[in-house]
């Protein structure tokens, strides 16, 4: 019962986590314009993995996709790749875990097969969560570096009359969604791996061993001392599947109209 609950909860937590990773990947607010002391701005900039947006005071929002691959920073490409790998692994993990659920019966699937599938999906969720956390953390690190660089040159041309104010970017909502979602997927994966241990059938096969004495034959069935004497076998059936076909997920994000004033 506890195993089924752990497996079910792991599945649900992972499902929420992967949905969060997909949402974070699609979101436009990976980085948002730093407003310093001014909470209201006439022009508000924010950027995602796939496009950058500008929201004007009227609420009009204009988004432009990054239509170049070669012109994009390598770090951004790396973050995209990590998030997509996380989504793909998570999606495959979900698919595998559905069939591994103890509460779902598919033909005459043995518990050992379910245990293997549970472990496979658990590992996939863990890797998926780690990919998401890594992707978001790389992007956050990039933002921090750029933030302090632009703060150092906040105003260029201070000697002359004209000032060019650099737009500084800070953490957007997508980063927090990504971190939480990655964490949930990771936790869900760990729960699936724990559930796998309970699903694996314990086989204790004791083989009868004959001792031929000089006068009469006695058959001994070694029991309590088997561990120390090396008699018998305590076999745990564990097999690890290394899953892995990958598919490209098309990511589409939509402009949002927010009134800032």
């Amino acid at each position: 019962m506890a195993v089924t609950a752990c497996q079910g909860l792991g599945f649900v937590v992972s499902l929420i986590g992967i949905a969060g990773i997909i949402a974070a990947t699609c979101m436009d607010q990976w980085s948002t314009q730093d407003l310093y002391n001014n909470p209201v701005t006439a022009v508000f900039n924010y950027q995602g993995l796939w496009r950058s947006c500008v929201r004007e005071s009227s609420g009009f929002t204009e988004c432009r996709g990054y239509f170049t691959l070669l012109g994009l920073p390598a770090m951004l490409q790396a973050v995209r790749a990590l998030m997509i790998v996380g989504i793909v692994l998570g999606a495959i993990g979900l698919l595998v875990s559905i069939f591994a659920l103890k509460c779902i019966r598919i033909g005459s699937m043995e518990d050992s097969a379910k245990a293997n599938m549970t472990l496979t999906s658990g590992i996939m969720f863990i890797v998926s969560g780690l990919c998401a956390i890594a992707g978001v953390s790389v992007f956050a690190n990039m933002l921090v570096t750029n933030f302090w660089m632009s703060t150092a040159n906040m105003y260029t041309g201070m000697g002359g009359m004209v000032q060019t104010v650099q737009t500084r970017y800070t953490f957007g909502a997508a980063l927090f969604v990504g971190w939480v979602a990655g964490g949930l997927t990771l936790i869900g994966g760990v729960m699936m791996c724990i559930a796998c241990r309970g699903l694996a059938p314990e086989e204790t096969n004791y083989k009868a061993v004959s001792y031929h004495a000089s006068g009469h034959s006695v058959a001994y069935k070694p029991g309590g001392f088997k561990a120390s004497t090396g008699f018998g076998s305590n076999t745990k059936n564990k097999k690890i599947y290394d899953g892995g076909a990958r598919t490209e997920d098309e990511v589409q994000s939509y402009p949002s109209k927010h009134d800032y004033v």
Epitope: A42, V54, S58, F60, T167, V261
Partner: antibody, heavy 120, light 113 residues
Framework: QVQLVQSGAEVKKPGASVKVSCKAS????????MLWVRQAHGQSLEWMGN????????YYALKFQGRVTMTVDRSTSTVYMELSSLRSEDTAVYYC?????????????WGQGTLVTVSS | DIVMTQSPDSLAVSLGERATINCKSS????????????LAWYQQKPGQPPKLLIY???TRESGVPDRFSGSGSGTDFTLTISSLQAEDVAVYYC?????????FGQGTKVEIK
């Protein structure tokens, strides 16, 4: 067609308050920000603040903060601008203007203006 | 606050001639996020409210004659009337639409020579 019709001219004593109205028609009132701009005689234009008719959210120029209050009455599609503690330098024509959605924060329609004279 | 400085203060041009008004801002009005300039030009005739001519530094508002054109980027902008007509006699203002508080130039009065 889009129209912004403002209330009539006002003469006020120093220290008093004035409330100017601006009635909008010809468009969906709550979809566009409304701004208030004033112009002293022979002078340039001066932005006073904005009001979002949908939320009633306001943003005032620092110069007028504490003295200006912008309100909205959605039932009559009217915005109001109240300026308190009037001084002689507040004598000006007060305009309401609509922020043209997608026009890079420019003001596409203006009221005819309300002359406020502050005199003892 | 962004300071908008127009030049000249007044301009006398013959009918059919070109009139050029300059506007300089103390900070860049260019937004890197969408590669747009947030500057507007208004025309104000005596006893009338201002009328929007140009937004985004170079986009003509609908209904505005094509003799009016805007150019420039960053901190330097220009309004050009290619062939001055009698009805163009007015005061012209540039406006910072990039940052609060919105600020206007002091105005340029255009007259017929």
């Amino acid at each position: 067609q889009v129209q912004l019709v403002q209330s009539g001219a006002e003469v006020k004593k120093p220290g008093a308050s004035v409330k100017v109205s601006c009635k909008a028609s010809g468009y969906t009132f709550t979809d566009y920000l409304m701004l208030w701009v004033r112009q002293a005689h022979g002078q340039s234009l001066e932005w006073m603040g904005n009001i979002n008719p949908y939320y009633g959210r306001t943003y005032y120029a620092l110069k007028f903060q504490g003295r200006v209050t912008m309100t909205v009455d959605r039932s009559t599609s009217t915005v109001y601008m109240e300026l308190s503690s009037l001084r002689s330098e507040d004598t000006a024509v007060y305009y309401c203007a609509r922020d043209g959605y997608s026009l890079r924060n420019a003001m596409d329609y203006w009221g005819q203006g309300t002359l406020v004279t502050v005199s003892s | 606050d962004i300071v908008m400085t127009q030049s000249p203060d007044s301009l006398a041009v013959s009918l059919g001639e070109r009139a050029t008004i300059n506007c300089k801002s103390s900070q860049s009005l260019f937004n890197s996020g969408n590669q747009k300039n947030y500057l507007a030009w208004y025309q104000q005739k005596p006893g009338q409210p201002p009328k929007l001519l140009i937004y985004g530094a170079s986009t003509r508002e609908s209904g505005v004659p094509d003799r009016f054109s805007g150019s420039g980027s960053g901190t330097d902008f220009t309004l050009t009337i290619s062939s001055l007509q009698a009805e163009d006699v007015a005061v012209y203002y540039c406006q910072n639409a990039h940052s609060y508080p919105y600020t206007f130039g002091q105005g340029t009065k255009v007259e017929i020579k």
